[in-house]
């Protein structure tokens, strides 16, 4: 990354340009590079108690570059900062620190959480879900015919998945019991979505109308719903509302 590192050479006099190594334009025996060739960045490297000038193609980690008219200079970022825009604004922190608004912190402030991938403090994101979709048709064993009581389902989508500290998503599926006007299955409807059963061809005198799977019927002896009086129907509706159950996968 920092290709040409100009170093001091033996028996160099201060400010002598000849014989400077690498990208140095001028150098001294004691201080290393004093200035750099065009487009290279000048940086001071601490070696023990001494600071040595070096010339680099770009500023090293923990430094930022300023292109002045007469010199390209590397300046140190704050101690906890790995990459910075300038002294005030860090853009990447050193290991163990989290970046928040240009500063490096040990812990993220209240209301924010640490993203351990980017090593930044980010807003806590709560789950967001859509409105419920309409209820599905009333079915029993995958069929919409040949029974009186079944279940219906509705779903909603997750619009925004929560972050680590965000509120979990509420249920996204809801199922409840439902009552339908019992109707016989039409030809070809039988076994739809549900378990298919092989049937003999009807005998000459037999009705061609499909006979519902005995398991699909609540009880053939039950009084059909259309015979219920209005009061019973109302009562049933109230009971069904109370029976409504929610089942779901929590995200």
């Amino acid at each position: 990354q920092n290709a040409s590192r100009g170093r001091r050479q033996r028996r160099m006099h201060p400010n002598v340009s000849q014989g400077c190594q690498g990208g140095c334009a001028t150098c001294s025996d004691y201080n290393g590079c004093l200035s750099c060739k065009p487009r290279l960045f000048f940086a001071l490297e601490r070696i023990g108690m001494k600071q040595i000038g070096v010339c680099l193609s770009s500023c090293p980690s923990g430094y930022y570059g300023t292109r002045y008219p007469d010199i390209n200079k590397c300046t140190k970022c704050k101690a906890d900062c790995d990459t910075c825009f300038n002294k005030n604004f860090c853009t990447k922190c050193k290991s163990g620190f989290y970046l928040h608004l240009g500063k490096c912190l040990d812990n993220c402030p209240e209301g924010l959480e640490a993203n351990n991938h980017t090593m930044e403090c980010v807003s806590i994101v709560h789950c967001e879900v859509s409105e419920w979709n309409p209820w599905s048709p009333c079915t029993k064993k995958g069929k919409t015919c040949g029974f009186k009581r079944g279940t219906e389902t509705r779903v909603r989508e997750i619009i925004q998945h929560p972050s680590a500290k965000g509120n979990l998503c509420p249920p996204t599926n809801e199922t409840r019991k439902c009552t339908v006007q019992r109707k016989k299955c039409q030809k070809g409807e039988r076994g739809k979505k549900g378990r298919e059963r092989k049937r003999k061809k009807p005998n000459k005198g037999e009705s061609k109308e499909a006979i519902p799977d005995s398991k699909s019927l609540e009880s053939s002896k039950e009084i059909p719903e259309q015979r219920e009086n209005k009061q019973q129907q109302k009562k049933r509706k109230v009971q069904d509302k109370q029976k409504s159950v929610s089942v779901s996968t929590v995200h």
Epitope: T66, R67, Y68, P69, F85, N86, K87, F89, T91
Partner: antibody, heavy 116, light 107 residues
Framework: EVQLVESGGGVVQPGRSLRLSCAAS????????MAWVRQAPGKGLEWVAT????????YFGDSVRGRFTVSRDNSKNTLYLQMNSLRAEDTAVYYC?????????WGQGTMVTVSS | DIQMTQSPSSLSASVGDRVTITCLVS??????FVWYQQKPGKSPKLLIY???RLQDGVPSRFSGSGSGTDFTLTISSLQPEDFATYFC?????????FGQGTKLEIK
């Protein structure tokens, strides 16, 4: 709290001189390059000059080079702009600002009017 | 010197609108780019640095994007306090240069 307070503005005749000052507080003044940026009435921002943190080098915009000088006194946390041979086109609000690639801190500005 | 071409020079918008201001730079400056906001009679205030990073205290409805020569400032939902003049600046090299400014006015 960072504060930059400019002073020394006023009305001056063309060809005359004026010296602006900027008193800094709330940050380590000697760590920062300091600059002057100006804004003519109803116009945009124009960089005027920057002096580096230790005062050893200064840079100027083309329109003021040779007429303006910039200096600083790190012991007093103060920045100066010496404006000579003033022209009508130097009329502007002059802002003192901490210049570290971006202009991070700004003063409230001081108005300089060059008019006969 | 690096030239900065900011557009539009003025813009009328309503509270709640999404607005975009652009700045074209005459040479590749990577992300060494800054946006400022200036309200009438006040000094400029640094809004975004390194092309996309928000300065402390700047609301999240402001965002910056771009790299190289094309940069954008977006305000997702204008608030009454956002009506001001916006300037871009390249921080890549000396001399520092600014865009001409975009005055954002209430429609």
């Amino acid at each position: 709290e960072v504060q930059l307070v400019e002073s020394g503005g006023g009305v001056v005749q063309p060809g005359r001189s004026l010296r602006l000052s900027c008193a800094a507080s709330g940050f380590t003044f000697s760590d920062y390059d300091m600059a002057w940026v100006r804004q003519a009435p109803g116009k945009g921002l124009e960089w005027v000059a920057t002096i580096i943190y230790d005062g050893s080098r200064a840079y100027f915009g083309d329109s003021v080079r040779g007429r303006f000088t910039v200096s600083r006194d790190n012991s007093k946390n103060t920045l100066y702009l010496q404006m000579n041979s003033l022209r009508a086109e130097d009329t502007a609000v002059y802002y003192c600002t901490a210049h570290d690639r971006s202009f991070d801190y700004w003063g409230q500005g001081t108005m300089v009017t060059v008019s006969s | 010197d690096i030239q900065m071409t900011q557009s539009p020079s003025s813009l009328s918008a309503s509270v709640g609108d999404r607005v975009t201001i652009t700045c074209l730079v005459s040479e590749d400056i990577s992300n060494d780019f800054v946006w400022y906001q200036q309200k009438p009679g006040k000094s400029p205030k640094l809004l975004i640095y390194a092309a996309s990073r928000l300065q402390d205290g700047v609301p999240s409805r402001f965002s910056g994007s771009g790299s190289g020569t094309d940069f954008t400032l977006t305000i997702s939902s204008l608030q009454p306090e956002d009506f001001a003049t916006y300037f871009c600046q390249q921080s890549y090299k000396y001399p520092p240069t600014f865009g001409q400014g975009t005055k954002l006015e209430i429609k």
